[in-house]
């Protein structure tokens, strides 16, 4: 912490600009004015302050604000940000999606930070929801945000959000997230003809049930291997040849080259060896012909 | 050991533009800010300006503004001047040099860029 | 901005003998920082915040002043110390540097 010293003759900042950048730090916390510098904050991001310089100015705004600072000061504070801890922002009350995108735009380019995460979290709590607005900003600057979020925390979103989402903001989302946001983009989408509602709905199917699925497979609409991948096991399961034939389409001859792995290799084991060479692939391990095939989900449902 | 290395010299027309590097390393280089100081012909020194590596936010000796441009890459650790519209006047060493911590003077000088503005 | 005069523009010294050169600013500054220069190199760091002497400065070296009034002081010249001498300060923007002293061996 700086010792408080009384500011040299003539050194007295007026106004905050370039000529504070070889102030020392006491003399930047002896001559500059914390309320000056809260009502010029937007100067600050202009003017080339080293890290030590910067750590001055933030002190002089704890002091000026224990509390937390205002939204307007927040608004610019540039690259000060990088200079709070998560602590720090829990004080804040940020509301303007402005405020939000400021901030976020020093960050650009860096991983999410804990500072970042937790402005994240203060700004949403604050608007009660996920809103469309929010979740565009968001995902500009951070495509993987909302695989981030809990499954909780994705059942706030609303359905008309769900417009903002690019296939690449759900390249880390594990099933369990794609389960809540699926119905929601269902919902969002139903009013599109098919082959548009297949594009926009490709990315959420790693959350449809087989009936879904099923529904799909009479579009048409030749469903790429990567989608294919990373639908349900369980949803898969039932599905027969011919349904994956039509869900597929061209792609069908894709699923040779993934016999072996999760859901092909599940789906294969419980299909008749018979309608598998239909598909003329050399798919093997499916039941052999004679064998009967009991559903025991089925008796355990009606037990 | 810290090491401020210049591009070499630079032979230029009047009227043209240069752009001079200074490559960094032994250090963090977003840590310390970088200074641009001319010398010409052996008489004393001139400051031009000053860049924060991290932020890219710049500071002009008011003599310099709209001569001198201070950019930095990050990537290569490397910061550099463009001098444009180049006249005899330009014709010097130019020296970037790092701050000191806390405003304790510039610690470490590059070689120097010798400039020389020529038809 | 801040003009900084250093006198002598030229001196000499034998060895062993104390030398000062000054630098006198046109306003007042809290510190000066000074550099050597040798011909055909870059100028070193050599006293900063006044009185503080850079890494490898020999001990024979010293720096005071306040105000306006700045001194660089050798209490006994030696061959390797001449050299060009500049002082420079930041307190005032834009930083500015003295015109030198050019200190040379008799």
């Known amino acids: 912490e700086v010792e408080k010293t009384a500011c040299p003759s003539g050194k007295k900042a007026r106004e905050i600009d370039e000529s504070l950048i070889f102030y020392k730090k006491w003399e930047l916390e002896a001559c500059v004015d914390a309320a000056l510098l809260a009502t010029q904050m937007d100067r600050v991001n202009a003017i080339p302050f080293t890290y030590e310089q910067l750590d001055v100015l933030k002190h002089k705004l704890d002091e000026l604000y224990p509390q937390g600072y205002p939204e307007s000061v927040i608004q610019h504070l540039g690259y000060l940000f990088l200079k709070m801890s998560p602590e720090d922002i829990r004080k804040w009350n940020v509301t303007s999606l402005e405020t939000l995108k400021a901030l976020l735009e020093v960050n650009k380019g860096h991983e999410m930070s804990p500072q970042v995460a937790t402005l994240i979290d203060r700004f949403v709590k604050g608007r009660g929801q996920l809103d469309k607005d929010t979740l565009d900003t968001l995902t500009a600057f951070y495509p993987g945000y909302l695989c981030s979020l809990s499954p909780e925390e994705l059942s706030s979103v609303p359905p008309s959000s769900i417009w903002a989402v690019r296939p690449q903001d759900l390249d880390t989302c594990d099933p369990r997230q794609l389960d809540v946001l699926y119905p929601k983009a269902r919902l969002a989408f139903q009013n599109m003809n098919g082959s548009e509602y297949f594009v926009k709905i490709q990315s959420f199917l790693g959350g449809a049930p087989t009936e879904d699925l099923k529904a799909l497979s009479q579009q048409n609409v030749s469903m790429d291997l990567a989608t294919f991948m990373k639908l349900r096991t369980d949803a898969v399961l039932p599905l027969t040849v011919a349904e994956v034939q039509k869900l597929l389409g061209p792609h069908v001859e894709g699923l040779k080259a993934e016999e072996r792995h999760r859901p092909v290799r599940d789906w294969i084991l419980r299909q008749r060896q018979d309608d598998l060479d239909t598909l003329g692939l050399g798919l093997q391990g499916g039941i052999p012909n004679g064998y009967l095939v009991l559903d025991l989900s089925m008796q355990e449902a009606l037990s | 050991e810290f090491q401020l290395q210049q591009s070499g010299p630079e032979l230029v027309k009047p009227g043209a533009s240069v752009k001079i590097s200074c490559k960094t390393s032994?250090?963090?280089?977003?840590?310390?800010?970088m200074n641009w100081v001319k010398q010409s012909n052996g008489k004393s020194l001139e400051w031009i300006g000053v860049?924060?590596?991290?932020?890219?936010?710049?500071g002009y000796n008011q003599k310099f503004k709209g001569k001198a441009t201070l950019t930095v890459d990050q990537s290569s650790s490397t910061a550099y001047m463009q001098l444009n519209s180049l006249t005899s006047e330009d014709s010097a060493v130019y020296y970037c040099?790092?701050?000191?911590?806390?405003?304790?003077?510039?610690?470490?000088w590059g070689h120097g860029t010798s400039v020389t503005v020529s038809s | 901005q801040i003009v900084l005069t250093q006198s002598p523009a030229i001196m000499s010294a034998s060895p062993g003998e104390k030398v000062t050169m000054t630098c006198s600013a046109s306003?007042?500054?809290?510190?000066m920082h000074w550099y050597q220069q040798k011909s055909g190199t870059s100028p070193k760091r050599w006293i900063y915040?006044?009185?503080k002497l850079a890494s490898g400065v020999p001990a024979r070296f010293s720096g005071s002043g306040s105000g306006t009034s700045y001194s660089l002081t050798i209490s006994s010249m030696e061959a390797e110390d001449a050299a060009t001498y500049y002082c420079?300060?930041?307190?005032?923007?834009?930083?500015?540097f003295g015109g030198g002293t050019k200190l040379e061996i008799k």
């Open positions: 306003s007042s500054v809290n510190y």
């Open positions: 040099a790092r701050g000191g911590y806390d405003g304790e003077a510039m610690d470490y």
């Open positions: 032994g250090y963090s280089f977003t840590d310390y800010n």
């Open positions: 860049i924060n590596p991290n932020y890219g936010t710049t």
């Open positions: 420079q300060q930041w307190s005032s923007y834009p930083p500015t």
């Open positions: 915040d006044t009185s």
